[in-house]
């Protein structure tokens, strides 16, 4: 089952997600999506990175940590009740079925 995280209406929510780059700066693509992780990629994408940078994001969603060191934790700004639900963090490690998938449940009070 999903790990549960809580935040209050109007505050920022923090959803942790980490990986260890094979070497400094040797990044892998990561996507964040609203909804449980599907078979591949992320549905309802709110943010994604490639091998170099954040290449897609939507308002209120950002990475506060140093994603170049593998901290791809998601911050959601000024949350509302509509932000409740499951979020997918997917670390897209190259290879055959190597992706790491994390489903995180956000509860807004």
């Amino acid at each position: 089952s999903e790990v549960e995280y809580r935040a209050e209406v109007g505050q920022n929510a923090y959803l942790p997600c980490f990986y260890t780059p094979a070497a400094p700066g040797n990044l892998v693509p990561v996507c964040w999506g609203k909804g449980a992780c599907p078979v591949f990629e992320c549905g309802n994408v709110v943010l994604r990175t490639d091998e170099r940078d954040v290449n897609y994001w939507t308002s209120r969603y950002w990475l506060n940590g140093d994603f170049r060191k593998g901290d791809v934790s998601l911050t959601i700004e000024n949350v509302t009740l509509a932000d409740s639900g499951i979020y997918c963090c997917r670390i897209q490690i190259p290879g055959i079925m190597n992706d790491e998938k994390f489903n995180l449940k956000l509860v807004i009070k």
Partner: antibody, heavy 123, light 108 residues
């Protein structure tokens, strides 16, 4: 226009392998995932797996793990599906199908299909 | 594995009538991850609906999709002669990707 052209029909003996190709044209090959789906005579659709044509991500259906290999050649915009240890139950039409997830679109759906390759397994 | 059960297996209707096809999932599927396809004899499937309710490019507006959770519906508001075919639902939510067994829509 966007199209997928597959290799021709194959007849194989049980225990043999078959390699089906799927050549893409009309779009940026490395921007879209490619599925392989098969359909036995008179039956429904069965998903076999998916490859990211950049070649860095492959997912196989558990049923086919160990027997299926999906590869790609970006120089010719072609994906391949090889199925080994063939048995009579593998007789089917094999389709490649592009998933339209990508290029800023984050929904899923197999929007372009090859014409299908008939593989017959018979002794 | 998520099992998709389509009903009815065969639907016999006349042109001009309304068709309602059902797809029930063995466990909840996000609506973002559900699609519908049409297949005619000797042809590859054609994407009709993605995200449970969005029409694919070039699909007439007589086709519509709805539903959430475990119950999804494809509706054809007024059947045209070219609509008689087999229809499949499909889910992307959990590996393996699965299809329903199909509903055959035939002319009455």
């Amino acid at each position: 226009q966007v199209q997928l052209v597959q290799s021709g029909a194959e007849v194989k003996k049980p225990g043999a392998s078959v390699k089906v190709s799927c050549k893409a044209s009309g779009y940026t090959f490395t921007s879209y995932y490619m599925h392989w789906v098969r359909q036995a005579p008179g039956q429904g659709l069965e998903w076999m797996g998916i490859i990211n044509p950049r070649g860095d991500s492959i997912i196989y259906a558990q049923k086919f793990q160990g027997r299926v290999t999906m590869t790609r050649d970006t120089s010719t915009s072609t994906v391949y599906m090889e199925l080994s240890s063939l048995r009579s139950e593998d007789t089917a039409v094999y389709y490649c199908a592009r998933d339209f997830y990508g290029s800023g679109n984050y929904y899923y759906g197999m929007d372009v299909w090859g014409q299908g390759t008939t593989v017959t397994v018979s002794s | 594995e998520i099992v998709l059960t389509q009903s009815p297996g065969t639907l016999s209707l006349s042109p001009g009538e309304r068709a309602t096809l059902s797809c029930r999932a063995s466990q909840s599927v996000s609506s973002s991850y559900l699609a519908w396809y049409q297949q005619k004899p000797g042809q590859a499937p054609r994407l009709l609906i993605y995200g449970a309710s969005s029409r694919a490019t070039g699909i007439p507006d007589r086709f519509s999709g709805s539903g959430s959770g475990t119950d999804f519906t494809l509706t054809i508001s007024r059947l045209e002669p070219e609509d008689f075919a087999v229809y499949y639902c499909q889910q992307y939510g959990s590996s393996p990707i699965t299809f329903g067994q199909g509903t055959r829509l035939e002319i009455k």
